[in-house]
């Protein structure tokens, strides 16, 4: 049973090398891959290893978030001598192996990208048989998902002293700029909270006091596009109605 060193060196390709006399593990991943939400992306990962002509059982794993301990999003296993890596796990069915692990390629395709996929991903290969060894990328590849703005919520809420306030929440990458327009407002960026903690792609803008009845429009814009939505405020004897 042999292991190889985990000392890491990197170049611009994030090549990670473990070496000891006459042995070498390395993994090559790009620092970042960019793609638009809804599209597909390829996460490249190739490796070298010290076990010449290894054709025993192997497993290919991709995980998200952090190396070694992050949740697995994809896993496949190839039997001894087989070039077919049988998928055992594909989160939401959106992950598919493009590369051939027998040819030192673990490249992964991610379908139907969402903003939530914007994370760092780590590839790992495991040998089990006469050879007992494994290697995992420590630095991984950042998947940068871009998206045109989308307004996910717009609402009118009561606030103290029989007043009303409006909230608009949008998502996008880059995070969109929000603007309100409406009766006696012109364009306003009042009380923009950007981005919400723990929700890196969400931006919220608040109009703290709606003083006039009428239509209030929230516009979200970034370099990829714009989106707008409206609410209507009508006060009938202290009641309010809002529609989008």
């Amino acid at each position: 049973f042999v292991r190889t060193k985990i000392d890491t060196t990197e170049n611009l390709l994030n090549t990670e090398v473990h070496s000891s006399p006459a042995q070498r593990w390395s993994m090559q991943v790009p620092p970042e891959v960019s793609a638009e939400a809804g599209d597909a992306a390829v996460l490249p990962c190739t490796f070298t290893h010290p076990h010449r002509h290894y054709d025993g059982p192997l497993t290919a794993i991709w995980r998200a978030g952090e190396p070694y301990a992050g949740p697995q999003v994809f896993r496949c296993a190839a039997a001894r001598g087989s070039e077919l890596c049988q998928t055992a796990l594909s989160l939401h069915g959106r992950f598919r192996l493009l590369g051939n692990p027998r040819r030192n390629d673990l490249s992964l395709r991610v379908e139907r990208l969402a903003l939530a996929d914007d994370r760092r991903y780590f590839c790992r290969v495991e040998f089990a048989g006469d050879v007992h060894d494994r290697y995992e990328s420590r630095h991984g590849v950042r998947l940068h998902v871009t998206a045109a703005p989308r307004i996910v919520n717009i609402s009118v809420l009561p606030s103290p002293a029989h007043a009303f306030r409006a909230l608009c929440t949008a998502e996008g990458e880059p995070p969109p700029a929000l603007a309100w327009s409406g009766p006696a407002l012109g364009n306003s960026l009042a009380a923009v909270r950007s981005p919400r903690e723990g929700h890196g792609h969400l931006v919220t803008a608040e109009l703290p006091a709606l003083t006039h009845d009428g239509r209030y429009t929230c516009t979200a814009a970034n370099s990829l596009g714009r989106s707008e939505a409206s609410v209507y405020l009508f006060r009938f004897h202290g009641a309010s109605g809002a529609s989008t």
Epitope: F1, V2, R3, T4, K5, I6, D7, H18, S20, P57, T59, I61, R63, P67, Y68, A69, G70, Q72, R75, A77, A88, L89, R124, E126, A128, H132, R134, E136
Partner: antibody, heavy 122, light 107 residues
Framework: EVQLLESGGGLVQPGGSLRLSCAAS????????MSWVRQAPGKGLEWVST????????YYADSVKGRFTISRDNSKNTLYLQMNSLRAEDTAVYYC???????????????WGQGTMVTVSS | DIQMTQSPSSVSASVGDRVTITCRAS??????LAWYQQKPGKAPKLLIY???SLQSGVPSRFSGSGSGTDFTLTISSLQPEDFATYYC?????????FGQGTKLEIK
């Protein structure tokens, strides 16, 4: 809740058999290698056995090879250790443990059961 | 088999102290080393994996370092709940082996 729960321990005579079970919950059981680790009273930790996520690869400490068999039922999220030809020196608390982030090996054990006591004595 | 040797076997310290425990492998194990904490009657708890990665939920006063054959677990400022036994473990090759343990006691 992510947890492991062992059962099946007890008092057994030398030469006897016992089967330990470990019920897993809160994680994708088949994605991870699982192990048994034991601890004799007042002593340190000793690795016993590991099984791959799919169950196709098993590994044993020399001290139990040929006597103990590790297995798993992924449909029941359960790990087993069949212990035969038990000896006094097998007396210990037996823990099941999950491998961190791996289907075949353990880079570390990140989740442990509470342990089950096995006493081998006449 | 790879032997893991911890030192010291026991150490007495006070709350607020900085404590260092070392672990030496009988051969190069790269960074395939983990540290565990165990309290009496309880299962071990993972603190550090792959020599220096802090397990989720473990306080940042715990840190690990080293590669090759020499490794260190450091507790920067001892808290009352840290008094326990600490084990190192190599996962470089099967059989996985543990150090004999270091008991951390209140001075």
């Amino acid at each position: 809740e992510v947890q492991l729960l062992e059962s099946g321990g007890g008092l057994v005579q030398p030469g006897g058999s016992l089967r330990l079970s470990c019920a897993a919950s809160g994680f994708t059981f088949s994605s991870y290698a699982m192990s048994w680790v034991r601890q004799a009273p007042g002593k340190g930790l000793e690795w016993v056995s590991t099984i791959s996520g799919g169950g196709g690869s098993t590994y044993y400490a020399d001290s139990v090879k040929g006597r103990f068999t590790i297995s798993r039922d992924n449909s029941k999220n359960t790990l087993y250790l069949q212990m035969n030809s038990l000896r006094a020196e097998d007396t210990a608390v037996y823990y099941c443990a999950k491998a961190i982030g791996s289907s075949w090996y353990s880079d570390a054990f990140d989740l442990w059961g509470q342990g089950t006591m096995v006493t081998v004595s006449s | 088999d790879i032997q893991m040797t911890q030192s010291p076997s026991s150490v007495s310290a006070s709350v607020g102290d900085r404590v260092t425990i070392t672990c030496r492998a009988s051969q190069d194990i790269s960074s395939w080393l983990a540290w565990y904490q165990q309290k009496p009657g309880k299962a071990p708890k993972l603190l550090i994996y792959v020599a220096s990665s802090l397990q989720s939920g473990v306080p940042s006063r715990f840190s690990g370092s080293g590669s090759g054959t020499d490794f260190t677990l450091t507790i920067s400022s001892l808290q009352p709940e840290d008094f326990a036994t600490y084990y190192c473990q190599q996962s470089y090759s099967i059989p996985y082996t543990f150090g004999q343990g270091t008991k951390l006691e209140i001075k």
